[in-house]
């Protein structure tokens, strides 16, 4: 029986050009974490494997940094980074736990008014 729960950083609004940390924490289980995948909209961003360490997908290498811990740092944010991010914990013997975080990237100083995304 899966007893664990995932706690996340919570949804985030961030400014274009900035950086944010996405973090998840698995609690209430003694299961062993074998791997954590970070994904966005069916795209794999990064993997942290208990034995092999971190692997960042080549297309995100410039803007994604591992950590802190099992979290992920996104840098040089663009409006196209707006979307839902998933932390997927592979554990033994429980199986898979998934956390969800929505990131909204705003144009600078428009959280209060104005359009959020500008098409170039």
């Amino acid at each position: 029986m899966m007893t664990g729960t995932i706690e996340t950083t919570g949804n985030i609004s961030a400014e274009k050009g900035g950086s944010i940390i996405l973090q998840c924490h698995l609690s209430s289980t003694t299961a062993q974490v074998t791997q954590v995948n970070w994904e966005q909209q069916d795209q794999l961003l990064a993997i942290c494997n208990a034995d092999l360490g971190w692997h960042i997908s080549p297309s995100f290498k410039d803007r994604v940094a591992p950590g802190p811990g099992l979290g992920l740092t996104l840098q040089s944010l663009t409006v196209n980074d707006t979307g839902e991010y998933f932390c997927i914990y592979h554990t033994y013997p429980d199986g898979t736990y998934t956390g969800r975080i929505f990131l909204e990237v705003l144009e600078s100083s428009v959280a209060e008014h104005g359009a959020r995304f500008q098409i170039p």
Epitope: I12, N80, T82, G83, R116, I119
Partner: antibody, heavy 117, light 112 residues
Framework: EVQLQQSGPELVKPGASVKISCKAS????????MNWVKQSHGKNLEWIGL????????SYNQKFRGKATLTVDKSSSTAYMDLLSLTSDDSAVYYC??????????WGQGTTLTVSS | DVVLTQTPLSLPVSFGDQVSISCRSS???????????LSWYLHKPGQSPQLLIY???NRFSGVPDRFSGSGSGTDFTLKISTIKPEDLGMYYC?????????FGGGTKLEIK
């Protein structure tokens, strides 16, 4: 003036599908997230999901995965929600609502869906 | 999913009254950056819901200053200082901090 104009009431048979539209005006359509909300029994509000007109990205409430499909047509500044395999439980008022920083600042007038044989 | 519990379910009032509506969350609504995405809405019969307050205490444009929001963590309150006829309807809180967003069950503000 920001306006979200939704399509009219629908009466459909169980098992059928329906497409509800939400035409936006008075602002940059691609600049804001569009949310969809279900109101059952004239009271309970449930978030169905959202779509990001800028890049087509979606996020769904797990409860509505497979039931609702969200799309947009940027050229007409219109958001759509397809509701599939309808049952009487889907009878409700459905709203589109513009989102910014996890608040819904403008809402459509609502579309009443009645599923009945 | 995060559960928002609103109290009271029904609030009979007289015009001119001051009232408070409570919204309690099953977990903290503060994200790791200190933002709390808790908003309040009024749904009048035959109309669309309208945004009153966002991020706990910020009044949306055009909302009268008799509406105010407060709270932190898991406990939030909407206060209406002097009830007017146009304030009658259903009030809902909404949390946007955790996926999926969830609404409170609503509080009906009605005349005594």
């Amino acid at each position: 003036e920001v306006q979200l104009q939704q399509s009219g009431p629908e009466l459909v048979k169980p098992g059928a599908s329906v497409k509800i539209s939400c035409k936006a005006s008075g602002y940059s359509f691609t600049g804001y997230i569009m949310n969809w909300v279900k109101q059952s029994h004239g009271k309970n509000l449930e978030w169905i999901g959202l779509i990001i007109p800028y890049n087509g990205g979606t996020s769904y409430n797990q409860k509505f995965r497979g039931k609702a499909t969200l799309t947009v047509d940027k050229s007409s500044s219109t958001a759509y929600m397809d509701l599939l395999s309808l049952t009487s439980d889907d009878s409700a008022v459905y709203y589109c609502a513009r989102g910014l920083s996890y608040r819904y600042d403008y809402w459509g007038q609502g579309t009443t869906l009645t599923v009945s044989s | 999913d995060v559960v928002l519990t609103q109290t009271p379910l029904s609030l009979p009032v007289s015009f001119g009254d001051q009232v408070s509506i409570s919204c309690r969350s099953s977990q903290s609504l503060a994200n790791s950056y200190g933002n709390t995405y808790l908003s309040w809405y009024l749904h009048k019969p035959g109309q669309s819901p309208q945004l009153l307050i966002y991020e706990i205490s910020n009044r949306f444009s055009g909302v009268p200053d008799r509406f105010s929001g407060s709270g932190s963590g898991t406990d939030f309150t909407l206060k209406i200082s002097t009830i007017k006829p146009e304030d009658l309807g259903m009030y809902y809180c909404l949390q946007g901090t955790h996926q999926p967003p969830t609404f409170g069950g609503g509080t009906k503000l009605e005349i005594k």
